[in-house]
């Protein structure tokens, strides 16, 4: 006969083990007993479990409710045992020894692998702006065993750098995201992907990246100036910017205080009907907590009656 | 090489009992556990039971009361006994041999009726 | 189609430690086994079939299907009481 087992068996920190010990044998072969230890280099044999075919199940003190055997329907050749709860400790070498009638002993080794997966967490850098040069986005650590894979996943480009800290029983795996900050980037995602094979798939974070900027800012408004005229309602001048964090607008006239009646909105100047007095220089002034900027533009409201020599009345008659 | 013949009858009265008979060859009854599984439209594969190697048995809970798994070593014969048939437990019923945890051969099926 | 390459899931409600067997069935034979405890091929078993998982999650694989392969398949779990799936039936489009 001949015992069939694994060489290596592999189980998640918490999860339970099968330790597989299956004698195959000739004719007529019994199996009597099935003894189970732990039996790492340059340590003593540490029993775990006795499973007898006439007396059944003795666990070892040291794990007491921890070993089981599998459930019935059971082949009494199988001398497999199932260990609960794995921690790391558990990690080692096993020894599954079968005594059989008549063919005597056989022994067989396998190796149990606790598998940590890493609980990966990920910091953001220091707040981005434009302008600034190669700057650390975002840093992402996993500690495992083995150690984990540690990767980005991402539309934006930069450069990623990687260091290792081993343990004792285990690694931590730090990479780091570095850019150089564009208005671009902004609201783009930034994925740290840790992969491990105590992982049923990869575990990802994701981080939005916010980089602080503030465009020029421009007044529309002014396209046709022949518009403001004298009596004209509903006009109005917007200032065009944008940043983040978005800004906030503020309007001033140049050449004194701004005119009654005149409506500020936000981003948006609104004028009463037209008369002279609302010409002069308008300024809008945007900023946010990055930057400031200024825009200014010159009004200037036309009186149509000064135009009335170069007008043609046709008067008909009949 | 390795295989499973089956013989029994194919119709079966209510109330009535069912025998097959699974004669093995190319491997010997001392070394490997034979199963037995059936297959019906309503409940497709079920597993009914198993004799091993060493002579003892388990049963389906859901037929432990009626069901009976026994075997002649010396003549390569295992021999299937269920009680009380009714109309649903017509089906195809099988024997096959046990590989650890599995089934790696399957005799070639007995269609069973249950109608009178 | 012939020449894709096609998965079989197979969920159990709990951990069956790799205790899983795969079988394909034809119309009117009986069903041949194709992979044991999960990974390992049954002798005969062409090499486009494998299996893997572990735990509650396992999957039978078949790269380059030939016509032959197109059948019902079965998943089969040995923890406690052996019990099969519903089974997959493969059809040629």
């Known amino acids: 006969g001949e015992l069939e087992t694994s060489d290596v068996v592999t189980v998640v920190l918490g999860q339970d083990a099968k330790l597989p010990c299956f004698y195959r044998g000739d004719s007529g072969e019994q199996v009597g007993q099935v003894a189970w230890a732990r039996v790492d280099a340059g340590e003593g044999a540490q029993e775990l479990a006795l499973l007898h075919s006439k007396y059944g199940l003795h666990v070892s003190p040291a794990y007491e409710g921890r070993v089981e055997q599998p459930p019935p329907p059971r082949n009494p050749l199988d001398g497999s045992v199932l260990l609960r709860n794995a921690v790391q400790a558990d990690e080692g070498e096993y020894e599954c020894r079968v005594s059989t009638f008549p063919a005597g002993s056989f022994q067989a080794r396998l190796r149990l692998r606790v598998l940590v997966p890493p609980l990966p967490s990920l910091n953001p850098g220091p707040a981005l702006e434009e302008g600034q040069g190669l700057t650390l986005a975002a840093s992402c650590t996993a500690e495992g065993s083995p150690a984990p894979s540690v990767t980005w996943d991402t539309e934006v480009k930069g450069t990623t750098s990687s260091r290792s800290f081993k343990h004792s029983r285990s690694a931590a795996v730090t990479s780091e995201f570095h850019l150089v900050p564009s208005r671009s980037m902004n609201g783009q995602p930034l994925t740290c992907v840790v992969s491990h094979p105590g992982l049923l798939q990869d575990q990802r974070i994701t981080h939005i990246l916010h980089v602080s900027f503030l465009a020029e800012a421009s007044v529309r408004g002014l396209e046709d100036q022949n518009l403001w005229h004298i009596g004209r309602e509903g006009a109005m001048l917007k200032c065009l910017s944008e940043g983040q964090p978005p800004p906030s607008y503020n309007w001033t006239r140049l050449d004194g205080p701004l005119p009654s009646g005149v409506r500020v909105d936000g981003d948006t100047l609104g004028f009463p009907p037209l008369t002279t007095e609302h010409s002069g220089i308008y300024v809008c002034h945007v900023s946010n907590e990055f930057s400031s900027r200024d825009s200014q533009v010159t009004v200037d409201v036309l009186d149509p009656q000064e135009d009335s020599g170069k007008q043609v009345d046709l008067v008909s008659a009949s | 090489q390795v295989q499973l013949k089956q013989s029994g009858p194919g119709l079966v009265q209510p109330s009535q009992s069912l025998s097959i008979t699974c004669t093995v060859s190319?491997?010997?009854?001392?070394?490997?556990?034979v199963h037995w599984v059936r297959q019906s439209p309503g409940k497709g594969l079920e597993w009914l039971g198993v004799?091993?190697?060493?002579?003892?048995?388990d049963y389906n809970a859901a037929f432990i009361s009626r069901l009976s798994i026994s075997k002649d070593t010396s003549k390569s014969q295992v021999f299937f006994k269920m009680n009380s048939l009714q109309a649903d437990d017509t089906a195809i019923y099988y024997c096959?041999?046990?590989?650890?945890?599995?089934?790696?051969?399957w005799g070639q099926g007995t269609s069973v009726t249950v109608s009178s | 189609s012939v020449g894709e390459t096609v998965t079989i899931t197979c969920r159990a409600s709990e951990n069956i430690y790799s205790n899983l067997a795969w079988y394909q069935q034809k119309q009117g034979n009986s069903p041949q086994l194709l992979v044991f405890a999960a990974t390992n091929l049954a002798d005969g078993v062409p090499s486009r079939f494998s299996g893997s998982g572990s735990g509650t999650q396992y999957s039978l694989k078949i790269n380059s299907l030939q016509s032959e392969d197109f059948g019902t398949y079965y998943c089969q779990h040995f923890w406690g009481t052996p019990t099969f799936g519903g089974g997959t039936k493969l059809e040629i489009k």
């Open positions: 004799i091993w190697s060493g002579g003892s048995t």
């Open positions: 190319g491997f010997s009854l001392t070394n490997y556990g």
């Open positions: 096959a041999r046990e590989l650890i945890h599995a089934m790696d051969n």
